[in-house]
Interface confidence: medium
């Protein structure tokens, strides 16, 4: 069976939305009215991976693009980056573990844990049009907190 | 004003010798970790040698390696370079650099001076 | 031994994006660094683990690796950003710390 999929945009607590800057990097930053028409809108894919009520392993790709979100190490640091793919073969439902996140929901809000990485995720600043990065903690100052917008395929 | 000056260079003919200092100022120099980084004439960048905080881990670059001793005096707030056996393709302006550590494989430069030029002639 | 290769020059009107490349078959695991140097002055850093950029650098400066490539993006480049820029990073082994060749940025 192929592997199901929803369109969505990010906002993180602070509503920031996330956008492209430059071929493979992502940014946080407030828009408002026209400008919301740049934020990022995800190819989110359920695939395989530990399940619970509450932590869903989803992929995070672009919709339309080859570019998936992926965790490498870089430096020995887990580092988060936008990883292109042949598109012919992805999204599928085994993904590579670089690619899988656990979706984790708690009081209405998202986390996005890397799976390769337990305890790191998905992150962004408190300032305003840095890059989307991931983080190894959580409840400090950057910020691990999302919300999801479905958007019609 | 955090910064950094080189002083120390000249002309000196090939086989000699030539001290380079660095006058940091503005930061806690012995919090750093201090490097070497040197440009040739119409040539790229080429790091050359690098100091632990404490002086007691030294590098070097193979091109340099056994000629060039790097050193810091914390109390002073400056850094070395003694460079014996000169060659003329160490003719290049040199530049101190310091190096923020944040383990093993993390070196970078993140505030360099304005650099003094050898000359090997 | 390790080398980190950009384009020589790359040339924009001012107010357009400029990009430059670094590629080096350690990228994919090594961060990328990237240095502005205008003759006669200090190198600045500009960019630091592939995409963070340090306080005081303009917003217009961004960076982004991915695979072998990293890429230092100027957005609305300015007749001050003229300078020669350098990518910096380590071989696979991270004991030899290297620089690309430079790529003089021109804005006309």
């Known amino acids: 069976a192929p592997v199901r999929s929803l369109n969505c945009t990010l906002r993180d607590s602070q509503q920031k939305s996330l956008v492209m800057s430059g071929p493979y990097e992502l940014k946080a930053l407030h828009l408002q009215g026209q400008d919301m028409e740049q934020q990022v809108v995800f190819s989110m894919s359920f695939v395989q991976g530990e399940e619970s009520n509450d932590k869903i392993p989803v992929a995070l790709g672009l919709k339309e693009k080859n570019l998936y979100l992926s965790c490498v190490l870089k430096d020995d640091k887990p580092t988060l980056q936008l990883e292109s793919v042949d598109p012919k073969n992805y999204p599928k439902k085994k993904m590579e573990k670089r690619f899988v996140f656990n979706k984790i929901e708690i009081n209405n809000k998202l986390e996005f844990e890397s799976a390769q990485f337990p305890n790191w995720y998905i992150s962004t600043s408190q300032a305003e049009n840095m890059p989307v990065f991931l983080g190894g903690t959580k409840g400090g100052q950057d910020i691990t907190d999302f919300t999801m917008q479905f958007v019609s395929s | 004003q955090v910064q950094l000056v080189e002083s120390g260079g000249g002309l000196v003919k090939p086989g000699g010798s030539l001290r380079l200092s660095c006058a940091a100022s503005?930061?806690?120099?012995?919090?750093?970790?201090m490097s070497w980084i040197r440009q040739a004439p119409g040539k790229g960048l080429e790091w050359v040698s690098y100091?632990?905080?404490?002086?007691?881990?030294?590098y070097y670059a193979d091109s340099v390696k056994g000629r060039f001793t790097i050193s810091r005096d914390n109390a002073k707030n400056s850094l070395y370079l003694q460079m014996n056996s000169l060659r003329a393709e160490d003719t290049a302006v040199y530049y101190c650099?310091?190096?923020?550590?944040?383990?093993?494989?993390?070196?970078?430069?993140?505030?360099w001076g304005r650099g003094t030029l050898v000359t090997v002639s | 031994s390790y080398e980190l290769t950009q384009p020589p020059s790359v040339s924009v009107s001012p107010g357009q994006t400029a990009r430059i490349t670094c590629s080096g078959d350690?990228?994919?695991?090594?961060?990328a660094y990237w240095y502005q140097h205008k003759s006669g002055q200090a190198p600045v850093l500009v960019i630091y683990?592939?995409?963070k950029r340090p306080s005081g650098i303009p917003e217009r400066f961004s960076g982004s690796s991915s695979g072998t490539m990293a890429t230092l993006t100027i957005s609305g480049a300015q007749v001050e950003d003229e300078a020669d820029y350098y990518c910096?990073?380590?071989?696979?082994?991270?004991?030899?710390?290297?620089f690309g060749g430079g790529t003089k940025l021109t804005v006309l």
């Open positions: 650099a310091r190096t923020p550590y944040s383990g093993r494989y993390h070196w970078y430069f993140d505030l």
């Open positions: 503005g930061f806690t120099f012995s919090d750093y970790y």
């Open positions: 100091i632990r905080s404490s002086g007691s881990t030294i």
């Open positions: 350690a990228l994919p695991i090594k961060y």
């Open positions: 683990e592939d995409s």
């Open positions: 910096y990073s380590t071989d696979s082994s991270g004991n030899h710390r290297v």
